[in-house]
């Protein structure tokens, strides 16, 4: 029961996490520029991985996509790649984990197969979460190291004078969404891996001694229904009948006088 709960909770946590990673990737507020005041209107500038937006105090908002790939910073491309890899891995992990859920019966799927699928999805969730955390952290590092900060400069040339005002970008909401979502996906993955250990069938190697009445030459050997990983002598989970009772460790030996009561 605890295994099912752990697996189910891991799935739900990962599902929320991946939904968060998708949301963060699509969000425009990865970085926000400090409020830019001017004599006309307050302008709020913010950027995402795919487009840049400007909002005026009047409420007017304009967003434009990055239609070029060549002019984009390599770091931005790397962040995009990490987030997409995280989403893809997470989506595959979700698909695998659905079939791995203990509460869902699909044909005659054995527990060992479900355990393997649970472990696979768990690893996928962990990698997915790490990708998201890495992507968000790389972007945050760009902001911290003043990648977005323009240096105050003024020069004259063709077309006049440009004054690049000291404006600074700060962390946008998407970064926090990404960190939390990545963390949740990571936790969900760990839970799935823990659940996998409980799902994996273990060999219960008891010394099974069978008894039968002296008037009969057939002995019932208990232990036929024990959990097996295929390493024991009774891999087919059948009732074993033979001429005398034997322990599991004495399958090859002949009956002796000690076998009978």
């Amino acid at each position: 029961m605890a295994v099912t709960a752990c697996q189910g909770l891991g799935f739900v946590v990962s599902l929320i996490g991946i939904a968060g990673i998708i949301a963060a990737t699509c969000m425009d507020q990865w970085s926000t520029q400090d409020l830019y005041n001017n004599p006309v209107t307050a302008v709020f500038n913010y950027q995402g991985l795919w487009r840049s937006c400007v909002r005026e105090s009047s409420g007017f908002t304009e967003c434009r996509g990055y239609f070029t790939l060549l002019g984009l910073p390599a770091m931005l491309q790397a962040v995009r790649a990490l987030m997409i890899v995280g989403i893809v891995l997470g989506a595959i992990g979700l698909l695998v984990s659905i079939f791995a859920l203990k509460c869902i019966r699909i044909g005659s799927m054995e527990d060992s197969a479900k355990a393997n699928m649970t472990l696979t999805s768990g690893i996928m969730f962990i990698v997915s979460g790490l990708c998201a955390i890495a992507g968000v952290s790389v972007f945050a590092n760009m902001l911290v190291t003043n990648f977005w900060m323009s240096t105050a400069n003024m020069y004259t040339g063709m077309g006049g004078m440009v004054q690049t005002v000291q404006t600074r970008y700060t962390f946008g909401a998407a970064l926090f969404v990404g960190w939390v979502a990545g963390g949740l996906t990571l936790i969900g993955g760990v839970m799935m891996c823990i659940a996998c250990r409980g799902l994996a069938p273990e060999e219960t190697n008891y010394k099974a001694v069978s008894y039968h009445a002296s008037g009969h030459s057939v002995a019932y050997k208990p232990g036929g229904f024990k959990a097996s990983t295929g390493f024991g002598s009774n891999t087919k989970n059948k009732k074993i009948y033979d001429g005398g009772a034997r322990t599991e460790d004495e399958v090859q030996s002949y009956p002796s006088k000690h076998d009978y009561v």
């Epitope: 520029q33 830019y36 001017n38 006309v40 209107t41 302008v43 500038n45 950027q47 487009r51 840049s52 400007v54 005026e56 105090s57 009047s58 409420g59 007017f60 304009e62 434009r64 996509g65 990055y66 002019g71 984009l72 910073p73 931005l76 977005w148 900060m149 323009s150 077309g159 006049g160 440009v162 004054q163 690049t164 005002v165 404006t167 600074r168 970008y169």
Partner: nanobody, 121 residues
Framework: QVQLVESGGGLVQPGGSLRLSCAAS????????MTWYRQALGKEREFVAG???????NYADSVKGRFTISRDNSKNTLYLQMNSLRAEDTAVYYC???????????????WGQGTLVTVSS
Amino acid sequence: QVQLVESGGGLVQPGGSLRLSCAASGSIFSIPVMTWYRQALGKEREFVAGISKGGTSNYADSVKGRFTISRDNSKNTLYLQMNSLRAEDTAVYYCNAQASSFGWMPLSDYWGQGTLVTVSS
């Protein structure tokens, strides 16, 4: 980079009219706000009028009712219609744009070289 080129300045009699233009060119990603400033000889640069892409406009008290600012977003061009000109309107008029040359770059202040408007009889 974003280049701004002003035109339309010249000599005009008091009470006359002029229309200034400012054309933005270059690697423009977005220009949220465009403004006109002026600087008279020996004085500090002062705000005249400005307009945002959303249509919000603002005027200095000294030009209200006389000057009209407009912009053509499709052409990235700013206009200033100046009526009932006075001698104190004599100055070099500068075009200013708060723009980003690339989407991931911060908004920056870009300035034109200015156009001279002389109001004299």
